[in-house]
């Protein structure tokens, strides 16, 4: 059939990507799996413009993104280069803080209440955002 050019139902289109915003919280790994089960990935922020778009939709709520350093260096889940890419950390973050008493440091990144990023314990049940590129999302009919 002809290629569709719209996002699945309940997803929001923006700049050739589709975004889905959760209403509940999950640990980072479950949020990651949730997005993968939707043939998507946790949101990868590549520009200030995309940062503002996501921030507008999530509001002042801790929300996971697709950035982690569970295996050493910081990595985006889709392979986007971290070192040369967009960053929006809070001052003095990431700090891999061990003082939370939950064991280990902080290996997963999230949007904070002001939109800037913080690293936190990956087991915390935060909301999350899934993202998929529009050409991938349109390979199948939208969810009905």
């Amino acid at each position: 059939g002809s290629e569709r050019t719209c996002c699945p139902v309940n997803w929001v289109e923006h700049e050739r990507s589709c975004y889905w915003f959760s209403r509940s919280g999950k640990a980072w790994a479950d949020a990651d799996n949730y997005c993968r089960l939707e043939d998507a990935h946790l949101v990868v922020v590549t520009s200030w413009e995309e940062q503002k778009f996501v921030q507008h939709h999530i509001g002042p709520v801790n929300t996971w993104m697709g950035l982690h350093d569970q295996n050493g260096p910081w990595k985006w889940v889709d392979g986007t280069d971290y070192e040369t890419g967009f960053k929006n950390w809070r001052p003095e973050q990431p700090d891999d803080w061990y003082g939370h008493g939950l064991g280990g440091g902080e290996d997963c990144a999230h949007f904070t209440d002001d939109g800037r990023w913080n690293d936190d314990v990956c087991q915390r049940p935060y909301r999350w955002v899934c993202e998929t590129e529009l050409d991938k999302a349109s390979q199948e009919p939208p969810l009905l």
Partner: antibody, heavy 123, light 107 residues
């Protein structure tokens, strides 16, 4: 009516391979994630594997990781489970189970199940 | 993985009895839990989703309750066709996990 029909089970020697199929009808197959769940004789249910609706992501129980491969052909409305390096403990009835449209509450949920196909691993 | 503790593992009851089965989880799963009925040689059939919502076509004598870590399936008045094995499934956290099952037998 939603229907799932498994096939491909049988008797196989340890170390051997089998490919299970699950033919789906009565719903828009490519809108749903799909799962395989197994049940050893006289035992409970064990989730085995899942696949996203377009097949881009796959998930496996630790007990089968590296030996089993889940796949799907949306043009044929069919789900597959390729089982390699089979062991005696893989002996079970294998069910395919339909996922649900994903909202927060339906992560890895399963609503409709097929009747199952029996896999026996024995020498 | 989330551990599912289902109890009792078996029970004997008579037609007309009220039967209660419990599923406890090792961590909070909100209400992301389903209940299934399985008869010998048959596929599991979902009775309850989202902990307390009745699946379409399932008799109203079945009900589910609970949230967090403790969940209950109740059959208000057991019928002959209800003698079967019942399982809970949590789908809040990966991997999805089932309870060990409860076999409901005729007394």
């Amino acid at each position: 009516e939603v229907q799932l029909l498994e096939s491909g089970g049988g008797l196989v020697q340890p170390g051997g391979s089998l490919r299970l199929s699950c033919a789906a009808s009565g719903f828009t197959f490519n809108n749903y994630a799909m799962n395989w769940v197994r049940q050893a004789p006289g035992k409970g249910l064990e989730w085995v594997s899942a696949i996203s609706r377009r097949g881009g992501s796959t998930f496996y129980a630790d007990s089968v990781k590296g030996r089993f491969t889940i796949s799907r052909d949306n043009s044929k409305n069919t789900l597959y489970l390729q089982m390699n390096s089979l062991r005696a403990e893989d002996t079970a009835v294998y069910y395919c189970a339909k996922g649900e449209l994903l909202e927060d509450y339906y992560y890895f949920a399963m609503d409709v199940w097929g009747q199952g196909t029996t896999v026996t691993v024995s020498s | 993985d989330i551990q599912m503790t289902q109890s009792p593992s078996s029970l004997s009851a008579s037609v007309g009895d009220r039967v209660t089965i419990t599923c406890r989880t090792s961590q909070d799963i909100r209400n992301d839990l389903g209940w299934y009925q399985q008869k010998p040689g048959k596929a599991p059939k979902r009775l309850i989703f989202a902990a307390s919502s009745l699946q379409s076509g399932v008799p109203s004598r079945f009900s589910g309750s609970g949230s967090g870590t403790e969940f209950t399936l109740t059959v208000s008045s057991l019928q002959p066709e209800d003698f079967a094995t019942y399982y809970c499934l949590q789908h809040n956290s990966y991997p999805p996990t089932f309870g060990g099952g409860t076999k409901v037998e005729i007394k």
